[in-house]
């Protein structure tokens, strides 16, 4: 073989006379005196098998040269590239009437690959070939030679193969190279879809629609299609494929993400480095595993760092005020890498004798602003029992606390409530009003906080505005206030006392004494 010759990727060579080892051995007619196989030397001193004829002396030349059978390989249109040298008749004195400067190209389709003779009538003419000005200068044996290149195409072809023939009509010519090829759109990958080798259509204007298949580790986004043009070029790519999760595009392929990288979705994005506190140990990771002690919340994206529960709140301070407690604390030293930190308060009521025997405080205790999901670092707890041991736990929580709850995430304080004064009296009533007296009655406070020792009634004339008031004390829950002025408005307040002291006065009760005796039941509103 004369050496490997490189042709465009979109051309498939069916015959290349330059690549044939030894003699070409094509069939000539007549057998002698017409086309002759001659070896010439190229610039590398390598023999080139050529066919030459130079019968310029006699008129009416009809010298035929036929190639061997050429398989079609499914091509419907083939191209014939002829490189030849044609001698100018002017350089051959005395032959002007008989010398020609053209030759004819023919073809014959056949399923028979062993036809031995040339039957001229079977052949169809492709074209008359003439030397034009588009020759190239080629070194042949140190001689600069004008090498013409002509390309013709023929189709549509339908039989298994065909023969080419060259008819000389009296030229001085050398066929230096005959190459027969068809065009294909070569296997290619576009938008991660692979399109197979596709032979071009029968017409020079035809487009062949080809559906692509997604490359390994990818999936269709839109159906990938392209058109194979007659010149062997792919046209109009439509649709595309995307690399699967765990894979990224590299040089038209979907490569698995490297260890330490991941890709969560089928997108055109590249693999990303595992987020902080996570890792992947296999290639092709779709997510990264959290390090020991680190977690992802359900709504955390795969791209977010793995986080952990917060450490315990710091600097918990309690302030007991009788049966209320105010708690304050500082944020944890370690928030676990999250912003969604909040605090929960756990209240436990513990026995005085055995602090380990604690039970939940129940629903009677109130928390301001709330017990759970606190965003602030303070809470006020009220309505506790007096003289009771309470343990309060402040839990720092975030989005991953539920995966690893631990006492390390809380801080606690134990307090004892003081003896508290009774609560205020809710309802004071005027049972009987006369010109000079008012009979009052009331209910025990909601929270006596101990044994009520007595009640204190404070009253004054409304016009005096508490500048001058009188006090009456009683152990009972009623009393008669005497010595009042007739037809005068009085304001009454009642409070209870225990060992811890007085509670708050009740809301004011306004009563006006009569001009004539009468019985009126007060409801806490003004009585006239």
């Amino acid at each position: 073989v004369t050496g490997s010759r490189v042709y465009p990727a979109n051309e498939v060579t069916l015959l290349d006379s330059r690549s044939v080892q030894g003699e070409l051995g094509w069939i000539a007619s007549p057998l002698e005196g017409g086309w002759e196989e001659v070896s010439i030397m190229d610039e590398k001193n390598t023999p080139i098998r050529t066919y030459q004829v130079c019968n310029v002396m006699e008129a009416s030349q009809n010298n035929w040269l036929r190639t061997d059978w050429i398989t079609r390989e499914g091509a419907q249109r083939v191209y014939i590239e002829i490189k030849f040298t044609l001698r100018d008749c002017n350089s051959l004195p005395g032959v002007m009437g008989t010398c020609k400067e053209t030759f004819n190209l023919y073809y014959y389709e056949s399923d028979n690959d062993k036809e031995r003779f040339i039957r001229e009538s079977q052949f169809g003419k492709i074209d008359t070939i003439a030397a034009d000005e588009s020759f190239t200068q080629v070194d042949i044996g140190d001689r600069i030679m004008k090498l013409n290149t002509e390309i013709r195409d023929v189709g549509p072809l339908s039989k298994k193969g065909f023969y080419l023939a060259f008819q000389d009509v009296g030229a001085c010519i050398a066929l230096v190279s005959v190459r027969v090829f068809y065009k294909k759109c070569p296997l290619t990958v576009r938008n991660l879809a692979q399109f197979p080798d596709t032979i071009t259509g029968a017409d020079t204007s035809s487009l062949v629609e080809v559906r692509g298949s997604c490359v390994n580790n990818s999936e269709e986004k839109d159906v990938p299609k392209m058109y194979c043009g007659a010149d062997g070029e792919w046209l109009v790519p439509i649709g595309n494929c995307l690399c699967n999760a765990g894979h990224e595009e590299q040089n038209g392929e979907c490569q698995a993400c490297k260890i330490g990288y991941y890709k969560a979705l089928s997108t055109d994005a590249s693999c990303a480095k595992c987020p902080p506190h996570s890792y992947s140990v296999w290639e092709g990771a779709t997510s990264c595993t959290c390090d020991r002690g680190f977690f992802r919340a359900d709504n955390d994206a795969a791209s977010m760092p793995c986080t952990r529960p917060p450490s315990a709140p710091l600097n918990l301070i309690s302030n007991v005020n009788e049966t209320s407690v105010n708690l304050e604390w500082s944020s944890p030293q370690n928030t676990g890498g999250r912003q969604d930190i909040s605090y929960n308060v756990v209240c436990k009521k513990c026995g005085a004798g055995d602090p380990s025997k604690c039970r939940p405080c129940g629903s009677g205790v109130h928390y301001t602003p709330q017990q759970n999901g606190l965003k602030t670092t303070r809470v006020s707890i009220t309505d506790l029992l007096a003289h009771t041991n309470y343990t309060f736990e402040i839990w720092a929580v975030n989005g991953v606390s539920k995966y690893n709850p631990s006492p390390d995430q809380s801080v606690s304080v134990t307090v004892t409530t003081n003896q508290a004064a009774p609560s205020s009296i809710a309802l004071v009533q005027a049972k009987e009003v006369t010109r000079y007296s008012v009979a009052l009655a009331w209910l025990e406070p909601d929270r006596p906080n101990g044994v009520i020792l007595e009640y204190e009634v404070k009253y004054y004339e409304k016009d005096q505005n508490e500048r001058s008031y009188r006090i009456v004390r009683t152990a009972a829950r009623n009393t008669d206030i005497k010595g009042l002025n007739p037809l005068t408005s009085y304001v009454f307040h009642v409070r209870a006392r225990t060992a811890a002291g007085y509670g708050d006065f009740s809301e004011p009760l306004e009563v006006t004494t009569n001009t004539v005796p009468s019985r009126i039941i007060g409801d806490g509103a003004n009585s006239t």
Partner: antibody, heavy 121, light 106 residues
């Protein structure tokens, strides 16, 4: 096989004429031009010219016009060289040679055995 | 008219040696000359013609090269039957021969 057959030696007096035949065989006579070459004793080759065997049209080299005539008889596939008014300096071996035209260059691929023409008084 | 000058006039070589014969044209020519071999008492024999093509039956120890005005015939390993006179010949509208180079036994 392809052959060119020339006649034997000729001895001529100055001023005389000679006609040297060259009979071709083994190929189509009219398909190839015929060339004539002179070689004086101890000298090199001199191309005299050639004749188109198809048309009979001759081409003469410089110095070989006038007294030298190329002719043909295609019926017997023979070419002739006729020299008139012979001179002593015409003494030489005269060769006929078949011309090979090719696209890359020409040459004389088949030669007759030569005819020695001696011009002597 | 193109004049061909051959050198050397005589080349002495031993059998098996390489022989290089030169042919120089008086002006640049577009093609290689033909080369002929002539032995005493024999007609010339065509060795090489257009594009350095060897004539039928010529062994491959004969090769020709060159371009422009300088051309060379090379006998790679001279055999005893190669001792002869060699002529170059330029073709065209007018053909001319060089004066010849004699290759003799050293």
């Amino acid at each position: 096989q392809v052959q060119l057959l020339q006649s034997g030696a000729e001895v001529k007096k100055p001023g005389a004429s000679v006609k040297v035949p060259c009979k071709a065989s083994g190929y189509t006579f009219t398909s190839r031009a015929m060339s004539w070459v002179r070689q004086a004793p101890g000298q090199g080759l001199e191309w005299m010219g050639w004749i188109n065997t198809n048309t009979g049209n001759p081409t003469y080299a410089q110095g070989f016009t006038g007294r030298f005539v190329f002719s043909l008889d295609t019926s017997v596939s023979t070419a002739y060289l006729q020299i008139s008014s012979l001179k002593a300096e015409d003494t030489a071996v005269y060769y006929c040679a078949r011309v090979r035209f090719t696209v890359y260059g020409d040459g004389m691929d088949v030669w007759g055995q030569g005819t020695l023409v001696t011009v002597s008084s | 008219e193109i004049v061909l000058t051959q050198s050397p006039a005589t080349l002495s070589v031993s059998p098996g040696e390489r022989a290089t014969l030169s042919c120089r044209a008086s002006q640049s020519v577009s093609s290689n000359p033909a080369w002929y071999q002539q032995k005493p008492g024999q007609a010339p024999r065509l060795l090489i013609y257009g594009a350095s093509t060897r004539a039928t039956g010529i062994p491959d120890r004969f090769s020709a090269s060159g371009s422009g005005t300088d051309f060379t015939l090379t006998i790679s390993r001279v055999e005893p039957e190669d001792f002869a006179v060699y002529y170059c010949q330029q073709y065209g509208p007018s053909w001319t021969f060089g004066q010849g180079t004699k290759v003799e036994i050293k």
